[in-house]
Amino acid sequence: GITIPRNPGCPNSEDKNFPRTVMVNLNIHNRNTNTNPKRSSDYYNRSTSPWNLHRNEDPERYPSVIWEAKCRHLGCINADGNVDYHMNSVPIQQEILVLRREPPHCPNSFRLEKILVSVGCTCVTPIVHHVA
Amino acid sequence: GITIPRNPGCPNSEDKNFPRTVMVNLNIHNRNTNTNPKRSSDYYNRSTSPWNLHRNEDPERYPSVIWEAKCRHLGCINADGNVDYHMNSVPIQQEILVLRREPPHCPNSFRLEKILVSVGCTCVTPIVHHVA
């Protein structure tokens, strides 16, 4: 196993009072291989609301590196390949579960955390506010 | 919370041989409360590649309810509000982490699982295959 400088405040695995704590098998099962293999690997470039991926790193989180989508333009790409500012590129956000070492540096104790990530962009008709 | 009949074969939380097991605090911390509240709540209708949301429920999984996006059209909505089949509506897919009760019905024992979900749709230029 890994040698980690152990935090002396790490909770005891047998502690009955550790709040809402469960045993989790970390042998992550992947249910995806037999699903639709048409993954969105190149959509970020082919979309009318294209996006770039930006790196966000936090070593106490798993996954530690999260690549977030940032829309390339305020508008959307039209049929001529130009940006049309009458439409808006907006991020599609998804709430995901990540694991955080808690207390920090404890190798056997984690907390589930929900974070919001942008996974891609879509082109939407803008909401126009008419001033009376 | 939900009352689940306990499986008599549930592993002992103290079992040192329970495979690759750690303690996880399920008192989920939500880091999203201070983020931009302009979530993509109405993008599914306003997008040029609109989608419907379908409920997927599994009581043996956490989160037990996952909303999946299904693109409404093969093509994309053009400026006239009609479907343009020269463009394609495609799902943006994302793997997420969920917890699955393992063995089933055990309240304190889970396995991490990756599942693929469709989060929304985006409009892309199709890949045209030219036949020689």
């Epitope: 196993g1 890994i2 980690i4 970390l26 042998n27 992550i28 992947n30 995806n32 291989t33 037999n34 699903t35 293999p37 993954r39 969105s40 690997s41 190149d42 970020y44 991926l53 790193e57 070593p59 106490e60 798993y62 996954p63 530690s64 590196v65 999260i66 690549w67 995901i96 694991l99 070492r101 190798p107 056997n108 990530v117 996974v119 | 690759r20 750690v22 943006i92 897919q93 994302q94 793997e95 997420i96 982490l97 990756k114 693929l116």
Partner: antibody
């Protein structure tokens, strides 16, 4: 850019044990995994096992189960691969490779090998 | 375990020619397939990840395609420096496995 530097060549006798190190620099050591891959002379690549640093959890190929132990020391950002009960069939170049474990482009964690050590030549001979 | 079978085992090619290497998986692996290049006496180097995604620093003549069980690595306009052995690798399920390799020689 992550760099992996492995320990030097080894000559071993049958029945002995081997321990190779892989020192990582650049990037956050805790965030990725290290796999060990070997290549016998004139042969292809063979995955032996790996460690996910964040959890300290290991996976081994069935063929090496019970004979291989992969460990890591977070304080020195070094991974180790120990192989016991050596035979002449274990003569090979041993590589460590980084597994990024990154949330990227639709994947929750990525499992390609994006950085490799220079290799450690191991000769087992009586 | 998932078996990856590459073809051909060996290819002798003239510079500027197009090279196509295929990799077939014994069961569906989605897009969890990666391609590596190994030059003589060097470590392998990642070329393409997740079937079709180009890795930064890798020349644009290298491209990948496929999903499910059938995958292709294409070198559009081979250069002398591309001589070496090419391996596919699946990360869909443990144990990770590699193809047997395809050796590309320059005529």
């Amino acid at each position: 850019e992550v760099q992996l530097v492995q320990s030097g060549a080894e000559v071993k006798k049958p029945g002995e044990s081997l321990k190779i190190s892989c020192k990582a620099s650049g990037g956050s050591f805790i965030s990725y995994g290290i796999s060990w891959v070997r290549q016998a002379p004139g042969q292809g690549l063979e995955w032996m096992g790996g460690i996910t640093h964040f959890f300290g959890s290991t996976d081994y190929a069935q063929k090496f189960q019970g004979r291989v132990t992969i460990t890591a020391d977070e304080s020195t950002t070094t991974a180790y691969m120990e192989l016991s009960g050596l035979t002449s069939d274990d003569t090979a170049v041993y590589y460590c490779a980084r597994e990024p474990n990154e949330f990227w482009n639709g994947y929750y964690t990525t499992h390609d090998f994006d950085s490799w050590g220079q290799g450690t030549t191991v000769t087992v001979s009586s | 375990e998932i078996v990856l079978t590459q073809s051909p085992d060996f290819q002798s090619v003239t510079p500027k020619e197009k090279v196509t290497i295929t990799c077939r998986a014994s069961q569906a692996i989605g897009s969890e397939l990666h391609w590596y290049q190994q030059k003589p006496d060097q470590s392998p180097k990642l070329l393409i990840k997740y079937a079709s995604y180009s890795v930064s620093g890798v020349p644009s003549r290298f491209s990948g395609s496929g999903s499910g069980t059938d995958f292709t690595l294409t070198i559009n306009g081979l250069e002398a420096e591309d001589a070496g052995t090419y391996y596919c690798h699946q990360s869909a399920s443990l144990p990770y496995t590699f193809g047997q390799g395809t050796k590309v020689d320059i005529k």
